[in-house]
Interface confidence: low
């Protein structure tokens, strides 16, 4: 969560030729007010579409009277800042809409009215927690001049307002896998808790409680795997309707790394690798010392006293990049052997094996008859990591304990009775039926269809079935 | 000033369920700390049972963990304890504490003495 | 789950002496990313609730006098008071916090000689 701040410095008549008239006067003062508008991402959109990251209206600024044959000058503004809050994480590349409105006060029926005098848009790279950002923009003959930041609400921090810290009573006093939340030393980052049962493997999030699903993944705790047969493109966003993967632009089209920085994707989106002197989501950030802190993940800091010499990252184990800011993925060796799935807890990997494995890396396969005897001469059949009995017949249940009860699938055909017999069963068959489960009819010139009963039967005798 | 204080009752029938809350005064529940439960058997030494993060989050003591049940009332800033199957070996005094997100445990109730007995 | 041993179980000191209790856990409690070892110590007297001394090993817990140090690394630690004070006197425990399951010593009790 966080905030994003607008500071309007002028607004009046841009350079060159044709000034614009003076939207107030004598016979019909006026004053201004502004509105913004954010959405996310860097998309073109109408003005009109939803502003999903926010808006937000200035006050109302000075009453405003046009002095008779006077150009028109920078018009007076309203007071403070515009202040657009944001619950989630700040998404670093942002579209805006900046409008500026006039109110006429003069004898309306009804109140004041309301007219547009100005809309200026544009598309943004902003850091969360960065400097402000001086903006000219220009609106048919008038200019407006603003900076903006986007700042984090305690207790989130970072580029993205998705790290959350809080001040502690001594320094530094963070646990496992929670850095202090730089630049403030007595601030720890506070453990991002996931939704309940999301997928360590493919399922992150950005707020506690959440649980965001890796690109191929979904399903509420991201345990589901995205089918790509029919797809053509492995890229871009899942569509939930087909279950697949719909073609998309790649993160890196266009290179957003500023600065010279190197793009690759990734599975989230894409990841910027930054020269020197730069870092940040998009490498947007300069002029960096050691005094700034630019190393993260508990990074050592060396050299770098001034903004023109370069400082060096030494990384912890498990982290690289200039500024140590990429977390080794260890899990992509692929440690776990039969199917185990891996943990990367930061201080060390873990495998979390699958029922009938065991060891480090899951490289035991136990013996699932070891041990286990099936009785009533059932033999032990070993497979998927757990044991079942091949029973003798006549018995049935998981240690063949149980005597099955053999003419529980009613064996005998054509209405035949059947009777449960110490080796198996027995068909006493209807008249006109012969066969061990009564399946021959009798032809009726005696005959049957099939070879005549075995010696010492007749037809309807109880044929047992051995 | 961070004050913790346990309530519940002091007696409690073998096989029942020994309840505790905890209330914190002086931090909100939903800071960056970890809330603990650890006991303490008369004449013996202290017992880690477990903690919960305020999003609903717990870590358990493995020998209790199929007893225990640790939950969060934000809008109470209070936190409670659930043990099940209680014998007279769970009889101790019961202390809540508030882990510092390093994990030591920095500030503590006075405890609350349980008993098992019929 | 990583076991926690103290030793000596009693120790018995003359007012003014150094005192030192050792801690063995039965892995290493050092978290190499930020070369930090996730121990505390605690003093506890009778009838009351057990007090944070020292955590990361040797960083004090403000407030407390500072004739009590913690050192150690890795599986071995001590905790020493420079000069026993009558106030001293009671049971002092170690425990690791390191990773979601924490265990604390058995306990060794201070008493004046």
């Known amino acids: 969560a966080g905030v994003f701040e607008l500071q309007i410095h002028s607004f009046g008549p841009g350079p060159g030729p044709g000034a614009p008239r003076s939207p107030c006067s004598a016979r019909l003062p006026c004053r201004l007010f502004f509105r913004v508008c954010l959405k996310p991402g860097l998309s073109e959109e109408a003005a009109e579409s939803p502003c999903a990251l926010g808006a937000a209206l200035s006050a109302r600024g000075p009453v405003y009277t046009e002095q008779p044959g006077a150009p028109a000058p920078d018009l007076p503004l309203p007071d403070g800042l515009l202040q657009v809050p944001f619950r989630d994480a700040w998404p670093g590349t942002f579209s805006f809409i900046i409008e500026t409105w006039r109110e006429e006060l003069g004898d309306q029926i009804g109140g004041p009215a309301w007219s547009l005098l100005a809309r200026v848009a544009g598309r943004r790279r902003l850091a969360a927690g960065g400097p402000w950002a001086r903006d000219i923009q220009r609106a048919g003959a008038w200019e407006l001049r603003f900076s903006y930041r986007a700042r984090c609400e305690p207790p989130a921090v970072g580029t993205a307002c998705t790290r959350l810290c809080r001040p502690r009573s001594a320094p530094s006093r963070c646990g496992p896998g929670l850095r202090p939340c730089a630049p403030l030393e007595d601030e720890c980052e506070a453990p991002l808790v996931c939704r309940a049962g999301c997928s360590p493997e493919h399922g992150f999030c950005e707020q506690p409680g959440e649980c965001r699903c890796l690109e191929g993944w979904t399903g509420p705790l991201c345990t589901v795997p995205v089918s790509t047969s029919s797809c053509l493109s492995p890229r871009g966003p899942s569509s939930a309707t087909t279950g697949c993967l719909v073609p998309g632009p790649g993160p890196c089209d266009g290179n957003p790394c500023a600065n010279g920085g190197s793009c690759s994707e990734t599975p989230r989106s894409f990841e910027c690798t930054c020269p020197r002197g730069f870092y940040g989501l998009r490498c947007e950030v300069s002029g960096v010392t050691c005094a700034d802190g630019p190393c993260f993940n508990g990074g050592l800091c060396v050299g770098g006293a001034d903004p023109d010499s370069a400082y060096i990252c030494h990384c912890p184990p498990g982290f690289q990049g200039s500024n140590c800011e990429k977390r080794v993925d260890r899990c992509s060796l692929q440690p776990c052997r039969n199917g185990g799935l891996c943990l990367d807890l930061g201080h060390a990997l873990r495998c979390r094996c699958r029922a009938g494995f065991a060891g480090p890396r899951c490289e035991h396969d136990l013996d699932d008859c070891a041990g286990r005897a099936c009785a009533n001469g059932g033999t032990c059949v070993e497979g998927g990591g757990a044991h079942r009995c091949s029973c003798a017949l006549g018995f049935g249940g998981r240690d063949c304990r149980e005597r099955a009860d053999p003419c529980a699938a009613r064996p005998c055909a054509h209405g035949g009775r059947c009777y449960a017999h110490f080796s198996g069963l027995v068909c006493a068959c209807a008249p006109g039926y012969m066969g061990a489960r009564c399946e021959f009819p009798v032809h009726p010139d005696g005959a049957s269809a099939l070879p005549a009963a075995p010696p010492g039967l007749r037809p309807g005798d109880p044929q047992r079935y051995l | 000033q961070v004050q913790l204080q346990e309530s519940g009752p002091g007696l409690v029938k073998p096989s029942g369920t020994l309840s505790l809350t905890c209330v914190v005064f002086?931090?909100?529940?939903?800071?960056?700390?970890?809330w603990s439960w650890v006991r303490q058997p008369p004449g013996k030494g202290l017992e880690w049972i477990g903690e919960?993060?305020?999003?609903?989050?717990?870590n358990y003591n493995p020998s209790l963990k199929s007893r225990v049940t640790i939950s969060v009332d934000k809008s109470k800033n209070q936190f409670s304890l659930k043990l099940s199957s209680v014998t007279a070996a769970d009889t101790a005094v019961y202390y809540c504490?508030?882990?510092?997100?390093?994990?030591?445990?920095?500030?503590w109730g006075q405890g609350t003495l349980v008993t098992v007995s019929s | 789950d990583i076991v926690m041993t103290q030793s000596p179980d009693s120790l018995a000191v003359s007012l003014g002496e150094r005192a030192t209790i050792n801690c063995k856990s039965s892995?290493?409690?050092?978290?190499?990313?930020?070369?930090?070892?996730?121990l505390a110590w605690y003093q506890q007297k009778p009838g009351q609730p057990p007090n944070l001394l020292v955590y990361?090993?040797?960083t004090r817990e403000s407030g407390v006098p500072d004739r009590f140090s913690g050192a150690g690394s890795g599986t071995d630690f001590t905790l020493t008071i420079s000069s026993l004070q009558a106030e001293d006197v009671a049971v002092y425990y170690c425990?690791?916090?390191?990773?979601?399951?924490?265990?604390f010593g058995q306990g060794t009790k201070v008493e004046i000689k």
């Open positions: 504490a508030r882990a510092a997100v390093a994990g030591a445990l920095d500030y």
């Open positions: 002086g931090d909100s529940i939903s800071s960056s700390n970890w």
């Open positions: 919960v993060f305020h999003s609903g989050s717990t």
């Open positions: 892995q290493s409690v050092l978290y190499s990313s930020n070369n930090k070892n996730y």
């Open positions: 990361w090993a040797s």
């Open positions: 425990q690791q916090y390191y990773g979601t399951s924490w265990t």
